[in-house]
C-alpha cells in the first residue's frame, strides 16, 4: 500500500481507514512527450526480435488507448533476414497502472487497476532441455 | 483527455470544468499477479541484449518502487558469449502513469504523472549513415 505521511495543509480525508479513496488531479504532469510508439522509434522493425504494435482501446479505462506488442516470429531474425530457430523471440512485459471507471460510465470515479502489457520483444537463448 | 459519458448513480462532481479532479479507489484490482521483474522471468540475463534492473524508489510517488532497465552492452551478445559491435543493444521504453503526491507528503491528494521507463533491452541493426 501507500505509506501515509501526515501534513497540515493537505486536503481533508473523511475516511478513517484512509487511504481507500483519494483525490487525483487529472491535469497530467508529463515528464516527457507522449507519442504513438510507432513514431517514437523504429526499434520494433529493426530488432532481431521484431514486433507488431496492436491498438487496444477501452473507453472505460484511462488511458483509453494502450499499444500492445506482439512478437512477429518465434525465432529471431538473422543478418540475412531469415529466421534463426535456435533462438527465441519473447515479449518483454510490464505491469502498469491504469484508471478504470467505477461504477461503469461514471466520469469522475475510478479505481486503480494493474494490467500486464507487452512493450516489445527481445531475443533470448532457449532453455535447453536435454532429451534422454 | 477522458471522454465523459453521463450516468445517474455516479458520485457527484462539484467542478464545472470537470474532470480536473476525480475520486480514485486505491484498492487495486490486479488483473495479474504482481512480481519482482527479476523473479518473473530470466529474460534479462538470457537476452542477446541483456540488461540490469535498477530499483528506483520515491515515497512521494505511487508506485513508490519502479524497476528501470539498463542495457549491459552497447553491442549484442553472440552465441559464443562475445559482444557483436555491429549490432546495438537499445532500451525499450514505455510511458507509464504514476500518482504523485500533491501537495507533497499529503496522503490523500495526488496528481497523475506520466513518466518514461526502460522496461528491457532489444538488439537492433544499427542505422548506417553513409559518409559522402
Amino acid at each position: 500500500g501507500i505509506a501515509i505521511p501526515r501534513n497540515s495543509g493537505c486536503p481533508n480525508s473523511e475516511d478513517k481507514n484512509f487511504p481507500r479513496t483519494v483525490m487525483v488531479n487529472l491535469n497530467i504532469h508529463n515528464r516527457n512527450t507522449s507519442t504513438n510508439p510507432k513514431r517514437s522509434s523504429d526499434y520494433y522493425n529493426r530488432s532481431t526480435s521484431p514486433w507488431n504494435l496492436h491498438r487496444n482501446e477501452d473507453p472505460e479505462r484511462y488511458p483509453s488507448v494502450i499499444w500492445e506488442a506482439k512478437c512477429r516470429h518465434l525465432g529471431c531474425v538473422k543478418a540475412d533476414g531469415n529466421v534463426d530457430y535456435h533462438m527465441n523471440s519473447v515479449p518483454i512485459q510490464q505491469e502498469i497502472l491504469v484508471l478504470r471507471r467505477e461504477p461503469r460510465h461514471c466520469p469522475n470515479s475510478f479505481r486503480l487497476e494493474k494490467i500486464l502489457v507487452s512493450v516489445g520483444c527481445t531475443c533470448v537463448t532457449p532453455i535447453v532441455h536435454h532429451v534422454a | 483527455g477522458i471522454a465523459i459519458p453521463r450516468n445517474s448513480g455516479c458520485p457527484n462532481s462539484e467542478d464545472k470544468n470537470f474532470p480536473r479532479t476525480v475520486m480514485v479507489n486505491l484498492n487495486i484490482h490486479n488483473r495479474n499477479t504482481s512480481t519482482n521483474p527479476k523473479r518473473s522471468s530470466d529474460y534479462y540475463n538470457r537476452s542477446t541484449s541483456p540488461w540490469n534492473l535498477h530499483r528506483n524508489e520515491d515515497p512521494e510517488r505511487y508506485p513508490s518502487v519502479i524497476w528501470e532497465a539498463k542495457c549491459r552492452h552497447l553491442g549484442c551478445v553472440k552465441a559464443d558469449g562475445n559482444v557483436d559491435y555491429h549490432m546495438n543493444s537499445v532500451p525499450i521504453q514505455q510511458e507509464i502513469l504514476v500518482l504523485r503526491r500533491e501537495p507533497r507528503h499529503c496522503p490523500n491528494s495526488f496528481r497523475l504523472e506520466k513518466i518514461l521507463v526502460s522496461v528491457g533491452c532489444t538488439c537492433v541493426t544499427p542505422i548506417v549513415h553513409h559518409v559522402a
Epitope: N52, K70, C71, L74, G75, G81, N88, I127, H129 | -
Partner: antibody, heavy 120, light 111 residues
Framework: QVQLQQPGAELVMPGTSVRLSCKAS????????MHWVKQRPGQGLEWIGE????????NYNPKFKGKATLTVDKSSSTAYMQFTSLTSEDSAVYYC?????????????WGQGTTLTVSS | DVVMTQTPLSLPVSLGDQASISCRSS???????????LHWYLQKPGQSPKLLIY???NRFSGVPDRFSGSGSGTDFTLKISRVEAEDLGVYFC????????FGGGTKLEIK
Amino acid sequence: QVQLQQPGAELVMPGTSVRLSCKASGYTFTSYWMHWVKQRPGQGLEWIGEIDPSDTYTNYNPKFKGKATLTVDKSSSTAYMQFTSLTSEDSAVYYCARSGIYYDYYEDYWGQGTTLTVSS
Amino acid sequence: DVVMTQTPLSLPVSLGDQASISCRSSQILLHSNGNTYLHWYLQKPGQSPKLLIYKVSNRFSGVPDRFSGSGSGTDFTLKISRVEAEDLGVYFCSQSVHVPTFGGGTKLEIK
C-alpha cells in the same frame, strides 16, 4: 468464412517457371501469415516458406531458398509462389495455408491445393 | 531440421473403438514463451489437411470433443475416443517452433 482458393492444376515444361496463386477471402488478409507447403504423391508435407502480407516480409525453408519466391497482391488479397528451374522433382501438390502470428503460429486453414505436373 | 516420427504408419480400427497415434520429435518443442508448438491435422483422400489440435491439446473450432491431444517435451499423443467413419484418413503431426516440419503420417482405416 475463411477461404483460400487455388487453381486445380498446372502443366509446365521442365526448365521453365510457374507462378501459383492463392486468393484469400473471409478474413483480413494482412493480419495473417501465408505459408506454402509441398506434398508429393504418397509422401509427407514439406514447408516451403511464409510471407507476411502486411509488409511482404518473407522467410524460407533453406531447402527452397532460391527455388521459390513468395509475393502478395494486397489489393486482390492474393498470395503467389513463383517456382523456377522446374524438374520432375517439383511435380507435387502445392498448398497455401494461413497462420496467425507468434502465439497463434500454426496453419489453421488450407487451400485445396494446386497439382503441378512438370513434364515434356 | 526437426524430425517428426509418427507411429504406427497404419492403424486399422473398428468403428466405435478408441484410436491412439504417437508423435515423437527429435528436439524439444517448448518455446521460451511457455508454449509448445505441436499440432495435429487430418487429411482425407483428395482433400487438403484440416487442423484438429493446436499447441498440444487445444481443439480447433468445430472439432468434435472425441479428439484430444496430450504430451510434452518430445512425446505427444492424439487420441480419438470413439472412431467414426468420417474420421478415416491420414493424420499428421507438425511442429512450428523450429523450421516447420511434419510427421510422415498415420493412416486410420477400417479393420
